[in-house]
């Protein structure tokens, strides 16, 4: 039950996170005009990854797309790439995780297959979240650098007579949406990975009881159908574990790829 809840919650959190990453990527307010300590203007500028906008106090808003690809700063291109990679990975992760959900039955899918899919989607969500956080952080760093550069030469003019106010940009709402969304996707991914451990074929944690009969030993596993029987010196190969009655052979028969989670 706890596994299903963890997996379900991880899915929902990731879904919200990816929706947020998509929203942040599409938003126009990645950077907004800094209003602090500036002359009050009747025009407000803000920029996104795909277009820049101007909102006049009259209410009229005009947006212009960045129609050039080669003319854009490399950093902006990198941020775009990171956000798109994050969205693509997240979308694939969501698709995979839908089929991995324990509450959904698809044919005769094994628990081990669901565990694999849960882990895969979890890793995808983690990478998706990291991509979004990295993209937003790169953009934020770019803004901070430009902000202090434009503050250094805030006013430029001829002999101080005619002044040109340089527009400074600060963090826009999209950055905060991106950070939160990236974090949620990351958390969702971690939750999926945690859920994966519990989805691996269940082990019965009963103490094994040994019954010794004359001439051979019998390892009896209560509640189970398998009884490991050995003769004479062969018994040493059939170790009885303290935590449960599994043989070395059985341990190796399960996929070991989940062991590191």
């Amino acid at each position: 039950m706890a596994v299903t809840a963890c997996q379900g919650l991880g899915f929902v959190v990731s879904l919200i996170g990816i929706a947020g990453i998509i929203a942040a990527t599409c938003m126009d307010q990645w950077s907004t005009q800094d209003l602090y300590n500036n002359p009050v203007t009747a025009v407000f500028n803000y920029q996104g990854l795909w277009r820049s906008c101007v909102r006049e106090s009259s209410g009229f808003t005009e947006c212009r797309g960045y129609f050039t690809l080669l003319g854009l700063p490399a950093m902006l291109q990198a941020v775009r790439a990171l956000m798109i990679v994050g969205i693509v990975l997240g979308a694939i992760g969501l698709l995979v995780s839908i089929f991995a959900l324990k509450c959904i039955r698809i044919g005769s899918m094994e628990d081990s297959a669901k565990a694999n899919m849960t882990l895969t989607s979890g890793i995808m969500f983690i990478v998706s979240g990291l991509c979004a956080i990295a993209g937003v952080s790169v953009f934020a760093n770019m803004l901070v650098t430009n902000f202090w550069m434009s503050t250094a030469n805030m006013y430029t003019g001829m002999g101080g007579m005619v002044q040109t106010v340089q527009t400074r940009y600060t963090f826009g709402a999209a950055l905060f949406v991106g950070w939160v969304a990236g974090g949620l996707t990351l958390i969702g991914g971690v939750m999926m990975c945690i859920a994966c451990r519990g989805l691996a074929p269940e082990e019965t944690n009963y103490k094994a009881v040994s019954y010794h009969a004359s001439g051979h030993s019998v390892a009896y596993k209560p509640g189970g159908f398998k009884a490991s029987t050995g003769f004479g010196s062969n018994t040493k190969n059939k170790k009885i574990y303290d935590g449960g009655a599994r043989t070395e052979d059985e341990v190796q028969s399960y996929p070991s790829k989940h062991d590191y989670v």
């Epitope: 203007t41 009747a42 500028n45 101007v54 106090s57 209410g59 005009e62 040109t164 106010v165 527009t167």
Partner: antibody, heavy 118, light 113 residues
């Protein structure tokens, strides 16, 4: 067509309070920001106050800030300007005007003369 | 406050003449976001309300005759009447529409010789 009609008391005594009203018709009032502009007799134009289309954002000329209040009632299609502690320097024709592209004032009322005299 | 300096304060010209008015602002009215200059030109006839002629420094308002034009960028702007007509007798104002408080030039009175 677009029409803006100002109305006011006309004559007022110094230090008194008065209110000017501008009634709009012929356009969706709630979609446009508005301003008041005044013109003292024989002088040039002076912008007085601005209000955004929703009424949440206002700006004032420093010469009137603290004394004048701009308000709007979108349900009644009305813009108002409350003038308090008036002086002879506030004597002017007061125009209400609509903002459009470029923040330009594309439509103006015919004006309302306010005379401050004892 | 942004100072708007208009020149000349008055001028007299003949019908058909080319009339030019200049307007200088104390700060640049060019917005970097859309590369537009927030300068507006108005015409005011005696006893009437002002009428919008040009916005964004060079955009002609709908219904305004094409003999009126505007140019300039940053801090220096020009308003031109290519061929003066009797009905153009009025006072012309430039306005800063970029910084609050929104400020007008002192006006240029155009008369017929």
């Amino acid at each position: 067509q677009v029409q803006l009609q100002e109305s006011g008391p006309g004559l007022v005594r110094p230090s008194q309070t008065l209110s000017l009203t501008c009634t709009a018709s012929g356009f969706t009032f709630s979609k446009y920001a508005m301003s008041w502009v005044r013109q003292p007799p024989g002088r040039g134009l002076e912008w007085v106050a601005f209000i955004s289309n929703g009424g949440s954002y206002t700006e004032y000329n420093p010469s009137v800030k603290g004394r004048f209040t701009i308000l709007r009632d979108n349900s009644k299609n009305q813009l108002s300007l409350k003038l308090s502690s008036v002086t002879a320097a506030d004597t002017a024709v007061y125009y209400c005007a609509r903002h459009d592209k470029g923040n330009a004032l594309d439509y103006w009322g015919q004006g309302s003369l306010v005379t401050v005299s004892s | 406050d942004i100072q708007m300096t208009q020149s000349p304060s008055s001028l007299s010209a003949s019908v058909g003449d080319r009339v030019t008015i200049t307007c200088k602002s104390s700060q640049s009215l060019l917005n970097s976001g859309n590369q537009k200059n927030y300068l507006t030109w108005y015409q005011q006839k005696p006893g009437k309300a002002p009428k919008l002629l040009i916005y964004w420094a060079s955009n002609l308002q709908t219904g305004v005759p094409s003999r009126f034009s505007g140019s300039g960028s940053g801090t220096d702007f020009t308003f031109t009447i290519s061929s003066l007509q009797p009905e153009d007798i009025a006072t012309y104002y430039c306005q800063n529409d970029y910084f609050y408080p929104l400020t007008f030039g002192q006006g240029t009175k155009v008369e017929i010789k």
